[in-house]
């Protein structure tokens, strides 16, 4: 019960996750205009990724996308890349997650099938986590710089002309989102690592006839793992996995414990 | 067509307060700002405040003690409420809609003289 | 609050000649965000409210005949007109709108010999 609410769980906060980083890399705010130098502008000025915008104090806004690639800081392309790469990661790993899940059943689909399909949709989530987190903490290591730099300007000159227009830039709320978005797939991923532990055949699983006081027989896989009969043993709450492929029948002549997660 | 005009009390008493009504057509408030200007005899423009679409209000530092400015956007009405007025308050007060920043239509303007 | 300082304060000109007015603001009125100069210029003719004439530095109000110009980037701003026309006698105002509180220059009076 435990290892589905886990997988459950990790792929809830992943799929939230994820929304996240496409809602961060859509969103237009990622630095915003600081007005600690002008406070009473009637012109706000925020960028994005993909666009910069104006929005003035009559409620009209104005954006413009950044249309050349090559002019376009090399930063800013790596922090493109690293969030498209975690949002690719992420879809990806929620497709795979999805067929993972303990609570679907596709066919005949083993369960060391799922466990190996949740470490991998686990891992991906992991990965896409660190590439958001990673975008977003560039791009916010980039505006830090930045913005010490015009605060120099401001008082010290370009060239020994002092600049009269300095627009500097602060952390939009798209880093945010960002990050806790990062986080939460991020979360998500280790979630389903952990449900893949508990869905995992135990290595140490018996090798030998198990015997019971019960009259049921016990099926023996020679080569495989043991068939649970879901009576008297795995009193240590392990998960135990047939050797072979069970039909439907037998699954309910024979219900084993995993049937009732 | 777009219109505006102000009306007001005309003479207005030291200390006493003025209330000037701008009615607008041709446009709804929900959409446009309305500033408000005004210009002392012989002399240049001084602007006082707007009122945003959102019913959000800017006003001009010196004035903003005294100065309020509100609206009713059913009856497409913006009001000018000036406090403890003095001599140098007589002037000819406008207001104009507000276009992406820019006044695009005036109104004709009252007069408040104020004097005892 | 950004001081606004037009220049001549009164020119008399004769019909048909080119006349320029500057307008200087103590801080930039340029936008990076959109490259705009958030800078207008109005006419007011004798007992008549202001009518706009120039936006954003440059553009021309629609129904403003073409041979009023508008220039100037940052602090520093023009107004041009090509040919003086008899009609143009007025004052000529320039306000900031970028930042409060919107600030008007002291005006230019235009007037014809």
């Known amino acids: 019960m435990a290892v589905t609410a886990c997988q459950g769980l990790g792929f809830v906060v992943s799929l939230i996750g994820i929304a996240g980083i496409i809602a961060a890399t859509c969103m237009d705010q990622w630095s915003t205009q600081d007005l600690y130098n002008n406070p009473v502008t009637a012109v706000f000025n925020y960028q994005g990724l993909w666009r910069s915008c104006v929005r003035e104090s009559s409620g009209f806004t104005e954006c413009r996308g950044y249309f050349t690639l090559l002019g376009l800081p090399a930063m800013l392309q790596a922090v493109r890349a690293l969030m498209i790469v975690g949002i690719v990661l992420g879809a990806i790993g929620l497709l795979v997650s999805i067929f993972a899940l303990k609570c679907i059943r596709i066919g005949s689909m083993e369960d060391s099938a799922k466990a190996n399909m949740t470490l991998t949709s686990g891992i991906m989530f992991i990965v896409s986590g660190l590439c958001a987190i990673a975008g977003v903490s560039v791009f916010a290591n980039m505006l830090v710089t930045n913005f010490w730099m015009s605060t120099a300007n401001m008082y010290t000159g370009m060239g020994g002309m002092v600049q009269t227009v300095q627009t500097r830039y602060t952390f939009g709320a798209a880093l945010f989102v960002g990050w806790v978005a990062g986080g939460l797939t991020l979360i998500g991923g280790v979630m389903m690592c952990i449900a893949c532990r508990g869905l995992a055949p135990e290595e140490t699983n018996y090798k030998a006839v198990s015997y019971h006081a019960s009259g049921h027989s016990v099926a023996y896989k020679p080569g495989g793992f043991k068939a649970s009969t879901g009576f008297g043993s795995n009193t240590k709450n392990k998960k135990i996995y047939d050797g072979g492929a069970r039909t439907e029948d037998e699954v309910q002549s024979y219900p084993s414990k995993h049937d009732y997660v | 067509q777009v219109q505006l005009k102000e009306s007001g009390p005309g003479l207005v008493a030291p200390s006493q307060s003025l209330s000037i009504t701008c009615t607008v057509s041709?446009?709804?408030?929900?959409?446009?700002?309305v500033h408000w200007v005004r210009q002392p005899p012989g002399k240049g423009l001084e602007w006082l405040g707007v009122i945003w679409p959102g019913g959000n209000t800017n006003y001009n530092i010196a004035l903003m003690s005294r100065l309020s400015i509100s609206k009713d956007n059913s009856k497409s009405q913006v009001f000018l409420k000036m406090n403890s007025l003095q001599t140098d308050d007589t002037a000819m007060y406008y207001c104009?809609?507000?276009?992406?920043?820019?006044?695009?239509?005036w109104g004709q303007g009252t007069s408040v003289t104020v004097s005892s | 609050d950004i001081v606004m300082t037009q220049s001549p304060s009164s020119l008399t000109v004769t019909a048909g000649e080119k006349v320029t007015m500057t307008c200087k603001s103590s801080?930039?009125?340029?936008?990076?965000?959109?490259?705009?100069?958030?800078l207008t210029w109005y006419q007011q003719k004798p007992g008549q409210p202001p009518k706009l004439l120039i936006y954003w530095a440059s553009t021309r109000e629609s129904g403003v005949p073409d041979r009023f110009t508008g220039s100037g980037s940052g602090t520093d701003f023009t107004l041009t007109i090509s040919i003086l026309q008899a009609e143009d006698l007025a004052v000529y105002y320039c306000?900031?709108?970028?930042?409060?509180?919107?600030?008007f220059g002291s005006g230019t009076k235009l007037e014809i010999k």
């Open positions: 801080q930039s009125l340029l936008n990076i965000g959109n490259q705009k100069n958030y």
């Open positions: 306000q900031n709108d970028y930042s409060y509180p919107f600030t």
């Open positions: 041709g446009f709804s408030l929900t959409s446009y700002g």
């Open positions: 104009a809609r507000d276009r992406r920043l820019a006044m695009d239509y």
